[in-house]
């Protein structure tokens, strides 16, 4: 019973935050949240960095400042991938929850 | 020293295929996202495609899009472009092109290699 | 797409000359913009990135400025070797790249 329910937590996990990906960055809320768990567990995307391609209000080149490992404004234009976190939000915030839920 | 190295270019009829090489040397190659660019004979500079660091990520310019493929060897240190059903307004001098990102610009250039596509 | 529009499309001038060419971008691109010096039969090369940094290997008579969409390219004393074909570029908006149709510079 334990494992379907982590299974369930992380396929809520997965489709809440891609969903969450759709309203960046229109939504202040929404953005600062992302942005938070993106810095904070160094992870880019919700299974990778090339996530944020698909957001239709964010330009092809670009992905959130706080996808960069040095975090300044602007460096998520145009970005260099060794210049970001590539992995994957989900799988690296799912390890955590495991881990702690 | 940098250097960029094209080949593969010539003489093509219209519909034709050429596959044009880039190689590469002086740099750690996986740090660059590379291009190419073509200039059309006494033409302006055309951005035609460029490819990620890994390969994970590739763009064309409208004008090639489905006829023209990008792709890269990392262990060869090597950049393709496989050109399909070419017409003759893709006649142009083809630059491999290193590319930092960010806004510094395509800070070095390979020497060209002419595409001619003519019946 | 960004439109990159450069004025003059040529101009003629002497050694010793000050000149100055513009770039005007069709939107904002902060300052994603650079500068090409470009002459016959040889590859482009980068002059100016970001707006206002000089390339390493850069000559000094060389400085660039400007913002958002307006942005200049500034040559202090023309010398015999910067007679070239010069191009303006964004990548703020990319793909695609795009660049300005290109100043010919003469020498008068």
């Known amino acids: 019973a334990g494992y379907v329910f982590r299974d369930k937590v992380m396929s809520e996990f997965n489709n809440n935050f891609r969903q969450q990906m759709e309203n960046y960055p229109k939504n202040n809320h929404t953005a600062s949240i992302l942005d938070r768990m993106q810095a904070d567990f160094k992870c880019c995307g919700a299974a990778n960095y090339t996530d944020w391609e698909k957001i239709p209000s964010m330009s092809k080149n670009r992905v959130p400042d706080s996808c960069c490992i040095n975090v300044t404004v602007g460096c998520g234009i145009n970005f260099n991938e060794k210049a970001i976190h590539k992995e994957g939000c989900v799988e690296k915030i799912g390890g955590w929850l495991r881990k702690n839920v | 020293q940098v250097q960029l190295v094209e080949s593969g270019g010539g003489l093509v009829k219209p519909g034709g295929s050429l596959r044009l090489s880039c190689a590469v040397s002086?740099?750690?190659?996986?740090?660059?996202?590379m291009n190419w660019i073509r200039q059309a004979p006494g033409k302006g500079l055309e951005w035609v495609s460029y490819?990620?660091?890994?390969?994970?990520?590739?763009y064309y310019a409208d004008s090639v899009k489905g006829r023209f493929t990008i792709s890269r060897d990392n262990a060869k240190n090597s950049l393709y472009l496989q050109m399909n059903g070419l017409r003759a307004d893709d006649t142009a001098v083809y630059y491999c092109?290193?590319?930092?990102?960010?806004?510094?610009?395509?800070?070095?250039w390979g020497q060209g290699t002419l595409v001619t596509v003519s019946s | 797409d960004i439109q990159m529009t450069q004025s003059p499309s040529s101009l003629s001038a002497s050694v010793g000359d000050r000149v100055t060419i513009t770039c005007r971008a069709s939107?904002?691109?902060?300052?994603?913009l650079n500068w090409y010096q470009q002459k016959p039969g040889k590859a482009p090369r980068l002059l100016i990135y970001?707006?206002?940094n000089l390339q390493s290997g850069v000559p000094s008579r060389f400085s660039g400025g400007g913002s958002g969409t307006d942005f200049t390219l500034t040559i202090s004393s023309l010398q015999p070797a910067d007679f070239a074909t010069y191009y303006c570029?964004?990548?703020?908006?990319?793909?695609?790249?795009?660049f300005g149709q290109g100043t010919r510079l003469e020498i008068n």
């Open positions: 970001g707006a206002s």
């Open positions: 002086g740099f750690t190659y996986t740090d660059y996202f």
């Open positions: 490819i990620s660091n890994s390969g994970a990520i590739k």
């Open positions: 570029q964004q990548s703020f908006s990319n793909p695609p790249v795009t």
């Open positions: 092109v290193r590319d930092p990102r960010s806004y510094y610009g395509f800070d070095y």
């Open positions: 939107q904002s691109i902060s300052n994603f």
